[in-house]
Each structure stands twice: as C-alpha cells, then as structure tokens.
C-alpha cells in the first residue's frame, strides 16, 4: 500500500492574505491530485501543474494567483487512481483561510442552505468564516441557539426543523447569512433496540430488573418473555423520554426472585407500521443463597528460588461481592513490612482475580499462606505452603578426637532448602590430594567407619563420619548439595602420633 502523500507547507492550516498568491505542493509515490473548495466554474484562478524533480516522487502544485474568500476551505492531496466515491477521500489535508473584511462567510451554493436531518441526528449548518478569529452566533425564531462552532465546518448540533441564520461581526460590521432550512427525515426501517441488565446474578429474595429501550420510534409494541411470565410475576413499566430524542424505556421488574426465575429474559420490539422485529436476550441466574468458589492456579506446595519474583493467582467466583484477604501463618499479611503485595481485580460480574506477589523471595517468606474470601452467606479459604529454595552452604566442618583410642569424628553442618544431602569423600595419599582422582566416595558399609545424618531444623543438617582409628594422615571432604547448588570443604585428619601437623583446609 502507498503511504499518504505529503504537502508543503507542512501545516494543518494557514491564513493567506486577501488578493495575495499562494501555492501548495503535494508529493506522492504515485500520481497525485488536488481536491479544493471551489467548483470547476469558480476555479479560473486556480492552476494545477505537475512538476519534475529528482526525488523519484510525483509532484503536483496547486497555485492561486489572487486569493479570495471563496478560496477558504479544505485542500486535499490524494492518489487519484485509488479513490472511489463511496469511501472518504484518503489523503493529506491543509485548511486555508482567506480573511476578507467584506465577506465574513465563505460563499455557498443554494443547495448548501438546505440541511436535511435524518432521524433527529446531529447536523451541520455549514456557515464557515473566512477568518478563524471571527466570532459567530446561530439564531432561529426563538433567539440564539446553543451549538458548538468550528470555523472549518460550521455549527454542529441537534436542530429542530425550521430556519437558522448565522451572524458574525467583523471590525464592527454585522454580517448575516441567508436562512439555512433544516428539514427532518423521520422513521427508519430498522429498530434500534438496546437491552440492559445491571446484574445477571441474583439470590433468592432479591428483585430482578431488566430494561429495554427503543430509540427514535414512537409506534412500537414490545413484549417480554421470561421464566415467571406464566405466573404473571413481573411488573412492566414504560417511560417515554422526549429530550434530546425519543426514547421508550420498558422496564421489567421481578420482585422476590426465586431459583425458578432463572433463565432467559427476552424483549421483542415490533414496529407497528412495518413487519420489522428486533429481539434482545439476557440470561439471569438466581441462587438459593450467596456462594463463593475459589480456584487457585497453583498447588498446595509451592517452591520459589531465593530472590525470585513470583506471582500466585487465585480465581474467585462469588455473589454477593466478596471481601478477599491474605494470611501468612494464620496472621494477616502486613504488606508494608514485607516485599509481598496483594491485589484484587474484578474480571466479570461475579469473577474476581486475586494475586499474591513476592517481589524478591527471602528465606523468611517461607510459610503457610491462606486466601480468605467471604460474603454474608459464605466463607471459603485456600492454604498453600511456600518454600523458599536456598542453595546449599556448609556452615561448619570440624573434627573431634577420641583421646587415646585414636578414633576421630568429623562433623559437617550444612544448610539449604530443600535440605542438602551430605556425601563424604576420602583421600588417603595426602601428597596427591590435589588430584581429583585420588578422592573416593566413602561408602556406608565400610567397616571401622560410621556415617550418620541428623536434621537440626527445617533447613540445617549435620552429617558425621567416625573413623575407629586413624593411623596415617588422611584428608576428608564434606560435600553438601541440593537442587540449587553444591558446596564442599576439606580437612586433614592426623594420626594421634602426628597431632602437631593438624591443619584445616
């Protein structure tokens, strides 16, 4: 598709001095044409010519040798081969004003003074000033008519039938147009029907209210079809609104609703004068009492990595509207003390979405979180456990000598979530411990060596390895690992006879 042509001067509007000359240049990717305010007969002083340039663009110039009030209007540059009459002219526009102290209003053809309004639509009374600064008022037989004015178009408003005159004052001189006559074309062949139900969900005992409005039509027959119709349960009302336009508002009220009043509520409007029918329908549901349903989008055990940002979303269906709150470990969540926020948004009439947001997960964010939704008829909650996952780290690696027996115990304390696994490795040739191949995993079933693990709390574990007798210097490695990471530390175990050599790596 071609991009829109461009105009020089590159302005939305321009004021041109009376009797001066002006030119407008249009540049396009294909052949361009100009649409301008005057008719062919009036445009003897408008010259259109094509211009050559080396940009590869098509250039068409519009030149006016002596500007007059009649040149005031919209100038549109467009691709002439793409336009069809039913489409709005698609192009680039500039509006030219040519102020003339003796011509306050742009001259019009006689047909422009006939303003036809269809179905009490808004209309434009096209009195346009030659000077954008000229104040204009609109008058009819009753005086000044309030309507919005745009010097490019005229007065825009909803006008009753009859004659209207535009009045302007230029340098103390008063100007009036000849009367514009507004005529109305009434009655459409369509029915404009709108249905409104402020609520579609109710509970027993409440009053159902549904309205149907017919616009711009006074001769209408409207019928209601609804579940309680046979019992004559509904009360129907008609309100006629005449200002600013005709509107017939039909209201159906069903008091003391029961579950049996659930179903389709339909209004059908028929034009009395024509075989034209329009129908609108809404589905209403009535519940015995209020309800709440909670639907989480996550499980009852959730994990979050340290420093991660995570959202927990819960869908809630409820009527009447619920109050939604969040608890942590059965205490109300105090948001301003933590990097945790919650919010609730209404998605549809009875659907809500609540979010718990962890901004930067910390270890202390672990715990039991509960969402509670309640209204006057029901309370529902959902609890899930959150674990902040922390990489393994070794807190301590120490040895413990068993006196003269020569036995030694090494204790390795590690933390992390999930709880780390502890693995032991041994290097028997102390000179070669820098080489990874010298290390072997310590199996549980080796005689004279006992390994054991104790959980200290939810995130700390202690592993122990006991050597019945250490006869030569060896190195022991503790390896703590979980899903998020691993850490290891080593220490030397020195035979009791070589005690003075003991070091911790």
């Amino acid at each position: 598709q071609l991009s829109l042509p461009s105009i020089l001067p590159n302005e939305n509007e321009k004021v041109v001095q009376l009797n001066s000359s002006f030119s407008l240049r249009c540049f396009g990717e294909s052949e361009v044409s100009w649409q301008y305010p005057m008719s062919e007969e009036e445009s003897s002083d408008v010259e259109i010519r094509n211009e050559e340039n080396n940009s590869g663009l098509f250039v068409t110039v519009l030149e006016v040798s002596s500007a007059s009030a009649a040149h005031t209007g919209l100038y549109t540059c467009y691709y002439n081969h793409t336009q069809t009459e039913e489409n709005e002219l698609e192009g680039r526009h500039i509006y030219i004003y040519v102020p003339d102290p003796d011509v306050a209003f742009v001259p019009l053809g006689m047909t422009d003074y006939l303003v036809i309004v269809e179905d009490d639509d808004s209309a434009i009374i096209p009195c346009r000033t030659t000077d954008p600064e000229t104040p204009v008022t609109l008058h009819n037989s009753e005086g000044v008519v309030p309507a919005s004015y745009d010097s490019r178009q005229g007065f825009n408003g909803t006008f009753t039938v009859g004659p209207y005159i535009c009045e302007a004052t230029v340098k103390g001189k008063k100007f009036q147009t000849i009367p514009f006559n507004v005529y109305a074309l009434k009655a459409t062949s369509e029915l404009d029907l709108e249905m409104e139900a402020l609520k579609t969900v109710y509970k027993s005992g409440e009053t159902i209210v549904v309205t149907c409005a017919v616009f711009n039509n006074e001769v209408v027959d409207l019928q209601w079809t609804y579940p309680g119709e046979v019992k004559g349960k509904g009360i129907t009302m008609l309100e006629e609104i005449k200002v600013p336009s005709i509107k017939l508002v039909y209201t159906l009220t069903v008091p003391e609703a029961t579950v049996k009043d659930s179903g389709d509520y339909e209004c059908a409007a028929r034009q009395a004068t024509r075989e034209v029918k329009e129908m609108k329908k809404v589905t209403i549901s009535v519940h015995e009492k209020g309800f709440i349903e909670i639907k989480p989008t996550f499980s009852q055990l959730e994990a979050v990595n340290l420093h991660e940002v995570k959202h927990f979303v819960v869908e809630v269906r409820a009527y009447p509207p619920p109050r939604i709150s969040w608890l942590k470990n059965n205490l109300t969540l105090i948001e301003n003390l933590t990097e945790i926020t919650t919010d609730v948004e209404k998605i549809q009439e009875i659907r809500y979405r609540s979010k718990l947001k962890l901004i930067r997960a910390k270890e202390e964010d672990s715990g039991h979180y509960t969402i509670v939704a309640q209204n006057e008829d029901a309370v529902k909650s959902y609890t899930f456990e959150l674990l902040t996952q922390v990489p393994s780290s070794i807190l301590d690696l120490v040895d413990d000598h068993h006196g003269s027996t020569g036995g030694q115990t090494v204790r390795c304390t590690a933390e992390g979530t999930p709880l780390p696994d502890i693995e032991w490795m041994i290097c028997k040739d102390i000179k070669k411990c820098n080489n990874e191949t010298s290390w072997t995993i310590l199996a549980n079933n080796v005689s004279n060596i006992i390994t054991e693990i104790h959980s200290r709390d939810r995130s700390t574990v202690e592993g122990r390895v006991t050597f019945a007798k250490v006869e030569e210097t060896i190195a022991v490695r503790c390896l703590a690992k979980n899903l998020l990471g691993a850490e290891n530390r080593e220490l030397k175990l020195v035979a009791p006879t070589l005690r003075s050599e003991l070091t911790v790596a």
């Epitope: 598709q1 081969h81 793409t82 336009q83 069809t84 009459e85 039913e86 489409n87 709005e88 698609e90 269809e118």
Partner: antibody, heavy 118, light 107 residues
Framework: QVQLVESGGGVVQPGRSLRLSCAAS????????MHWVRQAPGKGLEWVAV????????YYADSVKGRFTISRDNSKNTLYLQMNSLRAEDTAVYYC???????????WGQGTLVTVSS | DIQMTQSPSSVSASVGDRVTITCRAS??????LAWYQQKAGKAPKLLIY???SLQSGVPSRFSGSGSGTDFTLTISSLQPEDFATYYC?????????FGQGTKVEIK
C-alpha cells in the same frame, strides 16, 4: 488485522424479515463505504447494496430495491442489512465487504447463511 | 446496467499449466476491474485490482491485463492451491456487477 464478522442469518419464512449485522475491527470503519454481497447455493456472487462512509448515499441491486435497507453505525463499527418481505430466491450466504483498492473489495467477512423457506 | 461476461465457464488444467480467463464488459469501464479467487465454503479473495495491479500478498504467477471492455486474468504456472472459482467485477459506479465465474478444475 482487518476483521469483518457477519451475524443474524438463519431460517425464515417467506414474507418475513431478518436483520444482518457485520461487526468491523482493525481498520477505520468510518472512512470506508461498505457493501453487502450474496451468493446463492452453487451460484455466483451478486452485489446487493452499498452505503457511503458517511451514510450520505445508498444504492441497491434491482433485485432487492424497496425490500432491503442498508445502514451503519460508525460509533459501533457495525454495518446492517434489514431484509423485509423475504423470498425463496433471497436464500444465500451474505457477505459484508469493503476496500480501498480502486473500488475492489480488499476485505470480506466469513459470511452468514440466510435460508428463506416455508 | 453494465453486464460482465466471463469465459470459459470452466477449465480443466494440470499443475504447471498456463491458464487464461477472459472477462468482457458490455460498455467501456477503463481499468476499473478486479479479479477474485474463491474456494469452496470460503469468502472471495482479491487478486487483482485496477485491471493489472497485484494485491499485496498475492503470488506473482497471477497477472491481469486489459482496458475498456476486454480483460484477462492469467495464471502463469498453475499450482495445486489455485484450483478454485475466479470472478471478475467492475469496480466503478453501481451496481458493482460480477461475472458469472470460471471454475478451474484438475484435469
């Protein structure tokens, strides 16, 4: 992207009325003239009606003149076809269409089937 | 009203064939002519407008020519997806008459 979605089709008895709607999105609806085109089962395309971008003009095919009314609501981006005094020969898939390519129809709806039968 | 007449009403061809469809207007319409492709159960798709301008996204094997009263749609090398019905339409003034259609079938 440009989308036209027709609705309102169905089975109707001869002599009765039906109103078709065409919901537009993805383009400046109020700048385009809009058309209805129909296609009887196993037959070719037949142009039905046009309405100007600003509702200032309407034209109809001779076969529907006086019975069908085309209208539009630019505030709702919707085109309508009110079909009165329906006949068996009005049975067809009805498409709404429009476009900028020198009068050709760049975009079309998926169509809605109207069956006139007793 | 201006009548649009297409010929042939159907054509049998093989993949790779060159296919030509003609459309004649009962009065001159300059280059105000469009060509559409329609597959069973689908809406028509614009191929050519202004008699010879290729619509964006349409393969270059489709081309249009002509002016005044006689117009031609050519498919230079028929592909499996080209088996469909083709319509011409006048695009100036009203009614916007269509031709009766040409069905391109597998030989």
């Amino acid at each position: 992207q440009v989308q036209l979605v027709e609705s309102g089709g169905g089975v109707v008895q001869p002599g009765r009325s039906l109103r078709l709607s065409c919901a537009a999105s993805g383009f400046t609806f109020s700048s385009y003239g809009m058309h209805w085109v129909r296609q009887a089962p196993g037959k070719g395309l037949e142009w039905v009606a046009v309405i100007w971008y600003d509702r200032s003009n309407k034209y109809y095919a001779d076969s529907v003149k006086g019975r069908f009314t085309i209208s539009r609501d630019n505030s709702k981006n919707t085109l309508y076809l009110q079909m009165n005094s329906l006949r068996a020969e009005d049975t067809a898939v009805y498409y709404c269409a429009g476009g900028r390519s020198r009068g050709a129809f760049d975009f079309w709806g998926q169509g809605t089937l109207v069956t006139v039968s007793s | 009203d201006i009548q649009m007449t297409q010929s042939p009403s159907s054509v049998s061809a093989s993949v790779g064939d060159r296919v030509t469809i003609t459309c004649r207007a009962s009065q001159g319409i300059s280059s105000w002519l469009a060509w559409y492709q329609q597959k069973a159960g689908k809406a028509p798709k614009l191929l050519i407008y202004s008699a010879s301008s290729l619509q964006s996204g349409v393969p270059s094997r489709f081309s249009g020519s002509g002016s005044g009263t006689d117009f031609t749609l050519t498919i230079s090398s028929l592909q499996p997806e080209d088996f469909a019905t083709y319509y011409c339409q006048r695009t100036n003034s009203f009614p916007r008459t269509f031709g009766q259609g040409t069905k391109v079938e597998i030989k």
